[in-house]
Interface confidence: low
């Protein structure tokens, strides 16, 4: 994939040279007036009748450095007894992200987006039970 | 947060020009083999017991231009009869991602990197009942 | 949970010395360059030193060379800061910063420890 600015308001711009030298701003704001990083985790992820757990993914050439992956603790669904219920599934609710990864060894200092995919949480689905021909 | 150039690493890099004028490659690169992009978006927003919808939102100055929202459909959890079960609470699981914008009428383009936080899908979550003193 | 706790500042003469210190934990410590930060009164962050993952590269603002030196042991996830030759300019709250890449987002910080130099 890749990102193609509108040429046209800028009419000199070459597509190659824009895709590898645009410069960006890495000051990273918040389109949301609250410090998000400093959001204290949910624990729905205890609570849940699909529960998850999370695992840390870190990277040093990589912004955000540490990201947390979900994964599902049980391929069933908790019920109300707490016992697991073989009539539903926990799934695994993906999001397709953008990452920064440092080009190896540039100077002055270049980095390149990449698309990462990862589980968030989890949520519970009735079992899809196929019927025989 | 604050951000502080490790102006160092490159000599002769000035902390003012470092942060607004980095090079990135915008090539996206997926870190995984497949295609992400192209995958199928899951049904599991419709059979989920805490069912949810996708909005749209777009901007044609940021990367990606399309992000779609969750939002929850019900306040409660759907019961295995269809029902919606008041014991239970369906959740936003929101996800803390980079976007990238582009800094307005900038000629050539430049982008500046920002945090937003979006929802992803829901879960169903028991609810909590607090007792009285 | 990530966790720097900064110790050692107070105050100093002229010329004196002080060595701060930062214990960190939460993290893969020996995984990250580290930096200490400063601020002085009504004024905005300055970045002091940079230390590498391994210890071998050090960097420092043009105002400390010479007079500052930072260290770190991987083994005891710490961080230090040797200051020597204090002047009055370097009176500032000290911080110690986890480095994700550059630039450095500083999500994570101490409390900071304040280093007067005054007669």
């Known amino acids: 994939a890749a990102i193609i600015p509108q040429s046209s308001a800028c009419p000199n711009t070459e597509a190659k040279d824009f895709l590898q030298n645009v410069k960006v701003n890495l000051k990273v704001f918040n389109s949301l007036g609250a410090k998000v990083s400093s959001r204290r985790p949910s624990d729905y992820l205890n609570r849940s009748t699909s529960p998850w757990t999370l695992h840390r993914n870190e990277d040093p050439d990589r912004y955000p450095s540490v990201i947390w992956e979900a994964q599902c603790r049980h391929q069933r669904c908790v019920n109300a007894e707490g016992k697991l219920d073989h009539h539903m599934n926990s799934v695994l609710i993906q999001q397709e992200i953008l990452v920064l990864k440092r080009e190896p060894e540039s100077c002055p200092f270049t980095f390149r987006v990449e698309k990462m995919l990862v589980g968030v949480g989890c949520t519970c689905v009735a079992s899809i039970v196929r019927q025989a021909a | 947060a604050a951000i502080i150039p490790q102006s160092s690493a490159c000599p002769n890099t000035e902390a003012k020009d470092f942060l607004q004028n980095v090079k990135v490659n915008l090539k996206v690169f997926n870190s995984l083999g497949a295609k992400v992009s192209s995958r199928r978006p899951s049904d599991y927003l419709n059979r989920s017991t805490s069912p949810w919808t996708l909005h749209r939102n777009e901007d044609p100055d940021r990367y990606p231009s399309v992000i779609w929202e969750a939002q929850c459909r019900h306040q409660r959890c759907v019961n295995a009869e269809g029902k919606l079960d008041h014991h239970m609470n369906s959740v936003l699981i929101q996800q803390e991602i980079l976007v990238l914008k582009r800094e307005p009428e900038s000629c050539p383009f430049t982008f500046r990197v920002e945090k937003m936080l979006v929802g992803v899908g829901c879960t169903c979550v028991a609810s909590i009942v607090r007792q009285a003193a | 949970e990530v966790q720097l706790v900064e110790s050692g500042g107070g105050l100093v003469q002229p010329g004196g010395s002080l060595r701060l210190s930062c214990a960190a934990s939460g993290f893969t410590f020996s995984s990250y360059s580290m930096y200490w930060v400063r601020q002085a009164p009504g004024k905005g962050l300055e970045w002091v030193a940079e230390i590498r993952q391994d210890g071998s590269e050090q960097y420092y603002v043009d105002s400390v060379k010479g007079r500052f030196t930072i260290s770190r042991d991987n083994a005891k996830n710490s961080l230090y800061l040797q200051m020597n030759s204090l002047r009055a300019e370097d009176t500032a709250v000290y911080y110690c910063?986890?480095?994700?890449?550059?630039?450095?987002?500083?999500?994570?910080w101490g409390q900071g420890t304040l280093v007067t130099v005054s007669s």
């Open positions: 910063a986890k480095g994700e890449i550059l630039p450095l987002y500083f999500d994570y």
